[in-house]
């Protein structure tokens, strides 16, 4: 698997979208983990709802939020209030029992905001992403901007 490099501004939010084959991964929970070293274990940061049918509901651990659109085959991870310490190598995983299949490897880089508190705009396009199981990023231009997921009526 290729590693996708994503950059985000310190203090802002970074949104990672890992796509996958919805049929192949039917019924499987997803997880976001941080890799400890080049060949080290991947330490779980957050995983989707314990009930697969409710996987689209946001689950949070600290400043990291995950939600999974299981029908579309997209798991979205949001790293809020990005800090220098958040930089590193991560994985999107699909869980099957005790096994974890890597959907995408993501290298997160944190940039110091040269504009301080001003809006930075959309700065980044992924360097590389494979044709199907890729990752994308949306760079939040507002510090508290967040898409509601799911939409409430």
């Amino acid at each position: 698997l290729n590693t996708t490099v994503l950059q985000g501004m310190a203090g802002q939010s970074l949104r990672v979208s890992c796509t996958y084959d919805a049929l192949k991964h039917w019924g499987r929970r997803k997880a976001w983990c941080r890799q400890l070293g080049e060949e080290g274990p991947c330490q779980r940061v957050v995983s989707t709802h314990g009930v697969w049918l409710l996987a689209f509901l946001k689950k949070r651990n600290g400043s990291t939020v995950i939600a999974d659109d299981t029908l579309a085959g997209t798991v979205t991870i949001t790293l809020k209030n990005l800090q220098a310490g958040d930089a590193g190598l991560y994985q999107c995983q699909s869980l099957r029992g005790r096994e974890a299949e890597v959907l995408q490897k993501v290298l997160v880089e944190v940039l110091e905001d040269p504009l301080d508190d001003q809006d930075a705009g959309d700065l980044w396009v992924p360097e590389e992403s494979s044709s199907f199981e890729g990752a994308q990023v949306e760079h939040s231009t507002s510090r508290n901007q967040e898409t509601s997921f799911p939409p409430t009526s």
Partner: antibody, heavy 126, light 106 residues
Framework: EVQLVESGGGLVQPGRSLRLSCTAS????????MSWFRQAPGKGLEWVGF??????????EYTASVKGRFTISRDGSKSIAYLQMNSLKTEDTAVYYC?????????????????WGQGTMVTVSS | DIQMTQSPSSLSASVGDRVTITCQAS??????LNWYQQKPGKAPKLLIY???NLETGVPSRFSGSGSGTDFTFTISSLQPEDIATYYC????????FGGGTKVEIK
């Protein structure tokens, strides 16, 4: 009128089986998750399990105490949800309700149950 | 499993009184909480979903608030038809209900 009607309850001996039905009308059955709940006499509400909408291909989830004994299924052509209860125990004695999951959109719903049936009594006793 | 502690278990209030029921989760459940009303011999009725959203057709005297572990359900002006048992229900981890609060008129 949006309505759910349960049927199939009754007196059954421990270890035996029973199938409850929940007939839906007044809404597009395939679009909603359906759930079963129960309430033992004089007690509170307990979730039994639910089944996803047609989009989720009949995927089910159950509470731990009934897993392996109870099975939820649905028949879209008849707009009926079923609760198949096997190896019944005396502690399964309760009023059983079916309920409809509240829908946000094609993909999203919330396990807030906005339409309920009147309930059917299941008594497990020798 | 997440435990939902509802209090009080019962209360008696006068018509027109403000009634408050609390529900405490054993761990953070975000806003994944609903409130139901159940009258004797009847099925439950959804009043509030996602902690604070009023279900369509439910009178505005009913409201809900809270997030994390502490949630509140309020009837701003108790009416005779509000006599019932009220339940909270979480869905952050599977589905569990609080023990219920029986509301009576003084």
């Amino acid at each position: 009128e949006v309505q759910l009607v349960e049927s199939g309850g009754g007196l059954v001996q421990p270890g035996r089986s029973l199938r409850l039905s929940c007939t839906a009308s007044g809404f597009t059955f395939d679009d909603h998750a359906m759930s079963w709940f129960r309430q033992a006499p004089g007690k509170g509400l307990e979730w039994v399990g639910f089944i996803g909408s047609k989009a989720y291909g009949g995927t089910t989830e159950y509470t731990a105490s009934v897993k392996g004994r109870f099975t939820i299924s649905r028949d879209g052509s008849k707009s009926i949800a079923y609760l198949q209860m096997n190896s019944l125990k005396t502690e399964d004695t309760a009023v059983y309700y079916c309920a409809r999951g509240k829908r946000y959109s094609y993909t999203y719903w919330t396990p807030a149950f906005d339409v309920w049936g009147q309930g059917t009594m299941v008594t497990v006793s020798s | 499993d997440i435990q939902m502690t509802q209090s009080p278990s019962s209360l008696s209030a006068s018509v027109g009184d403000r009634v408050t029921i609390t529900c405490q989760a054993s761990q953070d459940i975000t806003n994944y909480l609903n409130w139901y009303q159940q009258k004797p011999g009847k099925a439950p009725k959804l009043l509030i979903y996602d902690a604070s959203n009023l279900e369509t057709g439910v009178p505005s005297r009913f409201s809900g608030s809270g997030s994390g572990t502490d949630f509140t359900f309020t009837i701003s002006s108790l009416q005779p038809e509000d006599i019932a048992t009220y339940y909270c229900q979480q869905y952050d981890s599977y589905l569990t209900f609080g023990g219920g609060t029986k509301v009576e008129i003084k």
